[in-house]
């Protein structure tokens, strides 16, 4: 019996087609993805093949103005229209709190939404009961397939799930649910979830009875053969893990942003064992037409967005590199721009001793979610900025000891190279890392811009001195693992909305051209 698994993950509000780098579509003939194009391809496969499941592995929420304005209602509407069979909860599904998940998505979705390792407690338990499930058994042709969900246990550090949801260890939580499916005589089981490729592989290895793992969160691109676009494969598709009980378990992920549709063919024997698996992500490029009915619906929903955000704020004459490939690995000019805007927003000339009360900015690279292409006449709109900074956070003022800052910069590179979000972009700071040294001892130089000076210059960080720093509220609250900031900050004052800070700066400057200028170096 052959099953076709179509899968998406980390779509992040890319309902409309995008440019190749998943930013706003500029040249329509070269654009990719979007739900109208996805629907065309999904429907073609459903027509041509007998046993097809369409699954999403989480993080539909957050990423463009669509989410800013519609707050998840767009996700439910268009996923319903595409007839998704199941979705796993991702960490970003909690960005607007539990209410922001329940009302627009959980109550409106016509497909099961899954997570086995999220347990509700207190008053929330009865309110959310039945709105998401640990697993669902789906009929597919003449057979049944069990889908069991999971969500990153790091979600409390990455989003806003509140205090009434407990995120358990994925493997510990999944095993009893899979065992339950086995007792129900379900012998074909897919683990669908949002914890990242490393956890996906562990689930494949450790959870007895899981036949296939469909993942997300790490934006992992897997491919067998010559890849069709710019993404470099992290491994073959499917990635085969040998389980502890000796089975070959295919693990898949489909990059992110709706650029690809994961396509996996699984052949099962009569006992539900995987005989073979093969496939590849399908690049949703312009050779695939956008479905007219879905496109018309998108255009109808789009009207509200156009009114919201299409006015020009200013211009850029350089590419604003907000790609994760840059901002999570090295200094990126989008990070520099945002930090400069954050400092600019906090210019308060107090007295003759200080040119300003604050000179330093830190910004988690993972919070920069999109580049901006200067080739669209250089125009920058609120909508463009909402794709870069989609989380609706604030840029806050904190006071920290130098020793806390040093810890933060060590944390920035403690697991460097895994495309994780904690890599810091900076302003008013010069940092040098030596990655040959062990984690926790990689910062070899950390100079900070003086404030008590008439001509600003860089001086070595003093461990016992108290510094003011502008940073996202996400970091002030210990997000991305920056627990030391939350635990050790001496003062915290809430600031202005992130997009507004940057948009005001761009409007003030009129024309911008941020550079990569040696703020972050590697020795």
């Amino acid at each position: 019996w052959e099953l076709t698994i179509l899968h998406t993950n980390d779509v992040h509000s890319r309902l409309e087609q995008t440019s190749e780098d998943s930013s706003k579509c500029v040249n329509a003939s070269r654009c990719m993805g979007g739900v109208a194009r996805l629907f065309t391809k999904v429907q073609q496969i459903r027509r041509a093949e007998p046993n097809v499941l369409l699954l999403d592995a989480g993080d539909q929420y957050q990423g463009t103005i669509w989410f800013t304005v519609y707050k998840g209602a767009e996700v439910a509407h268009f996923m319903n229209a595409l007839r998704y069979d199941a979705m796993a909860l991702g960490n970003h599904e909690f960005d607007n709190g539990v209410e922001g998940l329940i009302e627009p998505l959980l109550k409106e979705a016509k497909f099961p939404i899954l997570s086995a390792n999220i347990k509700a407690k207190g008053p929330l338990a009865s309110q959310i009961s039945g709105l998401y499930l640990p697993y669902k058994v789906l009929p597919v042709g003449d057979e049944v397939v069990g889908i069991v969900g999971y969500t990153s246990k790091e979600t409390p550090f990455l989003s806003n799930p509140g205090t009434n949801l407990v995120f358990e260890d994925e493997i510990t939580a999944l095993q009893p649910e899979v065992d339950k499916l086995k007792t129900l005589n379900v012998n074909k089981i897919i683990a669908l979830g949002h914890s990242g490729f490393e956890t996906d592989k562990l689930i494949a290895q450790k959870v007895r009875g899981v036949d296939v793992v469909v993942g997300g969160h790490s934006n992992t691109f897997l491919y067998t053969g010559n890849p069709p676009s710019k993404e470099v494969p992290a491994g073959k598709y499917p990635f085969i893990v040998t389980s502890d009980d000796g089975r070959k378990v295919p693990v898949v992920q489909a990059y992110a942003f709706g650029k690809y549709l994961g396509y996996l063919k699984i052949e099962f024997d009569e006992r539900g064992n995987v005989i073979s698996s093969h496939g590849n992500p399908i690049l949703l490029n312009s050779s695939i037409p956008e479905d007219p009915s879905i496109k018309a619906d998108i255009n109808k929903w789009r009207i509200k967005l156009d009114n919201y955000s299409t006015q020009e704020l200013g211009k850029t004459i350089v590419y604003l590199d907000g790609s994760s490939q840059s901002c999570r690995f090295r200094e990126c000019n989008m990070g520099n721009l945002i930090c400069d805007a954050m400092i600019n927003n906090n210019l308060r000339h107090a007295d003759e001793m200080f040119w300003n009360h604050v000179s330093m900015c830190i910004l988690n690279g993972g919070g920069i979610r999109s580049p901006i292409d200067e080739r669209n006449n250089g125009t920058i709109t609120w909508e463009n900025l909402a794709a870069v900074l989609p989380f609706g956070g604030t840029f806050d003022l904190v006071q920290l000891k130098g020793s806390t800052l040093k810890k933060a910069f060590e944390h920035s590179v403690h697991r460097y190279g895994q495309s994780t979000g904690e890599f810091l972009q900076v302003g008013g700071i010069h940092v040098v890392y030596d990655l040959s040294r062990k984690p926790g001892d990689r910062v070899v130089k950390l100079d900070v811009l003086c404030t008590k000076c008439r001509v600003p210059s860089y001086d070595p960080l003093k461990m016992d001195e108290i510094y003011k720093v502008i940073l996202p509220n996400f970091l002030a609250n210990g997000g991305d693992g920056f627990q030391m900031i939350k635990d050790e900050l001496l003062r915290h004052d809430s600031g202005d909305q992130d997009i507004n800070v940057v948009s005001t700066y761009i409007s003030k400057m009129k024309v911008i051209y941020p550079a990569v200028e040696g703020r972050i170096k590697f020795s």
Partner: antibody
Framework: EVKLVESGGGLVQPGGSLRLSCAAS????????MSWVRQPPGKALEWLGF??????????EYSASVKGRFTISRDNSQSILYLQMNALRPEDSATYYC??????????????WGTGTTVTVSS | DIVMSQSPSSLAVSVGEKVTMTCKSS????????????LAWYQQKPGQSPKLLIY???TRESGVPDRFTGSGSGTDFTLTLSSVKAEDLAVYYC?????????FGSGTKLEIK
């Protein structure tokens, strides 16, 4: 000029193997779905399978009659399509055609055909 | 699998006559999303490779004479030659490309009297 030229046919014993090649020219090979179709002497055409284009992942589909025995592959750098045939049976004797499907989405008919190469499976 | 049935299996006509051959599919080839019929017609002359004549049930391939016309929808399709020429001597095959495996009809052999 768009052209497909098959080669590699011949006489093979039952249970044997053969690899057919199809050299493509005159078009951007990577953009097209490519299929193999066969025709036993005096009989109808039979689709054997296809390999998708690069954007669609170069994955394959097969008819039940050859699945597990035949493998379609492509060398995009040399614009060559292959059909690896294993465990051949007398009923696999036929003229084998390499075909192209148009580049446009969902157009899975065959707009270009090769001249064919003959495979005879006999002891 | 979708089964394609062609009739008649052969027919003999004189030059200049109109000829009609039919193709029936075991399930509808009309796709509701785009209102297209996933059916093609091919011509195979003696000793030659097949050649595409018609696709989407009624769209003539570039260079095909306008005496060839495809029609029909759903499960019933027709290929019509309005005025047969001697060079039309061939076997004509229909093919569905609605779903895998793609399947051909058994062919209609057109002979010239």
């Amino acid at each position: 000029e768009v052209k497909l030229v098959e080669s590699g046919g011949g006489l093979v014993q039952p249970g044997g193997s053969l690899r057919l090649s199809c050299a493509a020219s005159g078009f951007t090979f990577t953009d097209y779905y490519m299929s193999w179709v066969r025709q036993p002497p005096g009989k109808a055409l039979e689709w054997l399978g296809f390999i998708r284009n690069k954007a669609d992942g170069s994955t394959t589909e097969y008819s039940a009659s050859v699945k597990g025995r035949f493998t379609i592959s492509r060398d995009n750098s040399q614009s060559i399509l292959y059909l690896q045939m294993n465990a051949l049976r007398p009923e696999d004797s036929a003229t084998y055609y390499c075909t192209r499907s148009p580049i446009y989405f969902d157009n899975w008919y065959f707009d270009v055909w090769g001249t064919g190469t003959t495979v005879t499976v006999s002891s | 699998d979708i089964v394609m049935s062609q009739s008649p299996s052969s027919l003999a006509v004189s030059v200049g006559e109109k000829v009609t051959m039919t193709c029936k599919s075991s399930q509808s080839l009309l796709y509701s999303n785009n209102q297209k019929n996933y059916l093609a017609w091919y011509q195979q002359k003696p000793g030659q490779s097949p050649k595409l004549l018609i696709y989407w049930a009624s769209t003539r391939e570039s260079g095909v004479p306008d005496r060839f016309t495809g029609s029909g929808s759903g499960t019933d399709f027709t290929l019509t030659l309005s005025s047969v020429k001697a060079e039309d001597l061939a076997v004509y095959y229909c093919q569905q490309y609605y779903s895998y495996p793609f399947t051909f009809g058994s062919g209609t052999k057109l002979e010239i009297k």
